[in-house]
């Protein structure tokens, strides 16, 4: 007996061929001998089966001696043995219908679990193998689980169901809801305007939710909420904002915050959380602000940075076009009795300059100028 695998919701075509290449009488029945469809002359006839409104045939093939049974919008319970009667002979086809669905939703927050459940007909013993968009293979029986979803898990999951040496392939589109970056660092000179951007790693038709930016300044003992906002159909509206600093927020996605000026007291790290409607859990993005200040007080030229810097970052003071006078893996460096000229304060990582501040040192009889 021929075995055909079908997918829930799909259309399947079961073939039946006569030796004579012409239109002759045929009938399709199920295992209970209930007539599904057949022909009477050149016309289709239908029986009293439960498939009545979902069964059809390809009439254009009848003259070639082919009498297929087409079943639309397949259901698991359509799994059965179908019998084609033509020319005093019977052809049997066993149809097995499978369904593969994702738990609750295909839009999941980063870190959540994905469970894929296989619906199968009684008596079948299928095996399932799924391949994630990043090429990771998982195997299982009736259910497959992937914990701690990552951003790279977004995309099409391809799952193969194997039964009786036949296979049927399912494609499930999974969207991992997350920010494009888990963390970012902004390096600014004191007084500069600061732009924070929080691009999302997914696109959906309608995006509704609410968010908040909590900030832990390096100099402060506790964190504080800088801004709260609502998101409705991709439109952003500010609910509450602190007076110091007075952040500004863009009205459209991607989420965009502007800090009028970088000051040492703002240096630190923040956590932007976004709670999406109908989703349990929140999206998070960490943002860090490093602020640099170069000053000259009497005979002391000082360069300082505030905020979360890694221990391997190098802070240097050098006279333009000269070797660094001082270079340390510390958050402050200084030069006593600096020579006149344009001094550069550099924050660098393995030779790559992250932040630079210039200060002009005048001969000792005059006051310094900061460009």
């Amino acid at each position: 007996k021929k075995v055909v695998l079908g997918k829930k919701g799909d259309t399947v075509e079961l073939t039946c061929t006569a030796s004579q290449k012409k239109s002759i009488q045929f009938h399709w029945k199920n295992s209970n001998q209930i007539k599904i469809l057949g022909n009477q002359g050149s016309f289709l006839t239908k029986g009293p089966s439960k498939l009545n409104d979902r069964a059809d045939s390809r009439r254009s093939l009848w003259d070639q001696g082919n009498f297929p049974l087409i079943i639309k919008n397949l259901k698991i319970e359509d799994s059965d043995t179908y019998i084609c009667e033509v020319e005093d002979q019977k052809e049997e086809v066993q149809l097995l219908v499978f369904g593969l669905t994702a738990n609750s939703d295909t839009h999941l927050l980063q870190g959540q679990s994905l469970t894929l459940t296989l619906e199968s007909p009684p008596g079948s013993s299928p095996s399932v193998q799924c391949r994630s968009p990043r090429g990771k293979n998982i195997q299982g029986g009736k259910t497959l689980s992937v914990s701690q979803l990552e951003l790279q898990d977004s995309g099409t999951w391809t799952c193969t169901v194997l039964q009786n040496q036949k296979k049927v392939e399912f494609k499930i589109d999974i969207v991992v809801l997350a920010f494009q970056k888990a963390s970012s660092i902004v390096y600014k000179k004191e007084g500069e305007q600061v732009e924070f951007s929080f691009p999302l790693a997914f696109t959906v038709e309608k995006l509704t939710g609410s968010g908040e930016l909590w900030w832990q300044a390096e100099r402060a003992s506790s964190s504080k909420s800088w801004i709260t906002f609502d998101l409705k159909n991709k439109e952003v509206s500010v609910k509450r904002v602190t007076q110091d600093p007075k952040l500004q927020m863009g009205k459209k996605l991607p989420l965009h915050l502007t800090l009028p000026q970088a000051l040492p007291q703002y240096a630190g790290s923040g956590n932007l959380t976004l709670a999406l409607e109908a989703k349990t859990g929140k999206l998070h993005q960490e943002v860090n602000l490093v602020v640099m200040r170069a000053t000259q007080l009497q005979k002391n030229l000082t360069c300082e940075v505030w905020g979360p810097t890694s221990p391997k970052l190098m802070l240097s003071l050098k006279l333009e076009n000269k070797e660094a006078k001082v270079s340390k893996r510390e958050k402050a460096v200084w030069v006593l009795n600096p020579e006149a000229g344009m001094w550069q304060c550099l924050l660098s990582d393995s030779g790559q300059v992250l932040l630079e501040s210039n200060i002009k040192v005048l001969p000792t009889w005059s006051t310094p100028v900061q460009p």
Partner: antibody, heavy 120, light 107 residues
């Protein structure tokens, strides 16, 4: 081009039988079903049945079983319909039509019709 | 048997007017529907098959549409020679059945 030529008008007595013809030209007669349709004023169009000339296979509307009989002569490319035990209810215009190949086209060509009058 | 309900049963229209005739099947007929035109004393002439396919030689002002149970025939700009009776036919299932017809007359 495809043409279906039907026999002329008939005046018959109740209880008699009549055989009308439909001669096909312009295509391979054996390969296409010939349909028969009845039209009576105030009753619209009614499908009587069909014949596949090549095999002689026939199919009848339940309502016309025992009333109509189809035959075909492939040598003359002519299909026939015989109506028996005539009554006034059989007075109508009868059309033959060709069933489109592959069954997608419905009835693609029609004859000009044969008028039958049953009267004593 | 599948019942075909055609409407209106008769209608008056002016030359140049857009005319629509509808046919409703008692069940899904999978677009196996034809439209015919019949003039007094003449045999039916096929205009449309498979719900929307125009027969060769039929003017492009005729068009068919629909799916499932509901179908329509539209004449975009009525001409004098379009007067007559229009019928629909379902040929999805045995036995094929016709609509009762729509008589189209000049206003």
């Amino acid at each position: 081009q495809v043409q279906l030529q039907q026999s002329g008008a008939e005046l018959m007595k109740p209880g008699a039988s009549v055989k009308m013809s439909c001669k096909a030209t312009g295509y391979t007669f054996s390969n296409y079903w010939i349909e028969w349709v009845k039209q009576r004023p105030g009753h619209g169009l009614e499908w009587i049945g069909e014949i596949l000339p090549g095999s002689g296979s026939t199919s009848y509307n339940e309502k016309f079983k025992g009333k109509a009989t189809f035959t075909a002569d492939t040598s003359s490319s002519t299909a026939y319909m015989q109506l028996s035990s005539l009554t006034s209810e059989d007075s109508a215009v009868y059309y033959c039509a060709r069933r489109g190949y592959g069954y997608d086209e419905g009835f693609d060509y029609w004859g000009q019709g044969s008028t039958l009058t049953v009267s004593s | 048997d599948i019942k075909m309900t055609q409407s209106p049963s008769s209608m008056y229209a002016s030359l140049g007017e857009r005319v629509t005739i509808t046919c409703k099947a008692s069940q899904d007929i999978n677009s196996y529907l034809s439209w015919f035109q019949q003039k007094p004393g003449k045999s039916p002439k096929t205009l449309i098959y498979r719900a929307n396919r125009l027969v060769d030689g039929v003017p492009s002002r005729f068009s068919g549409s629909g799916s499932g149970q509901d179908y329509s025939l539209t004449i975009s700009s009525l001409e004098y020679e379009d007067m007559g009776i229009y019928y629909c036919l379902q040929y999805d299932e045995f036995p094929p059945t016709f609509g009762a017809g729509t008589k189209l007359e000049l206003k």
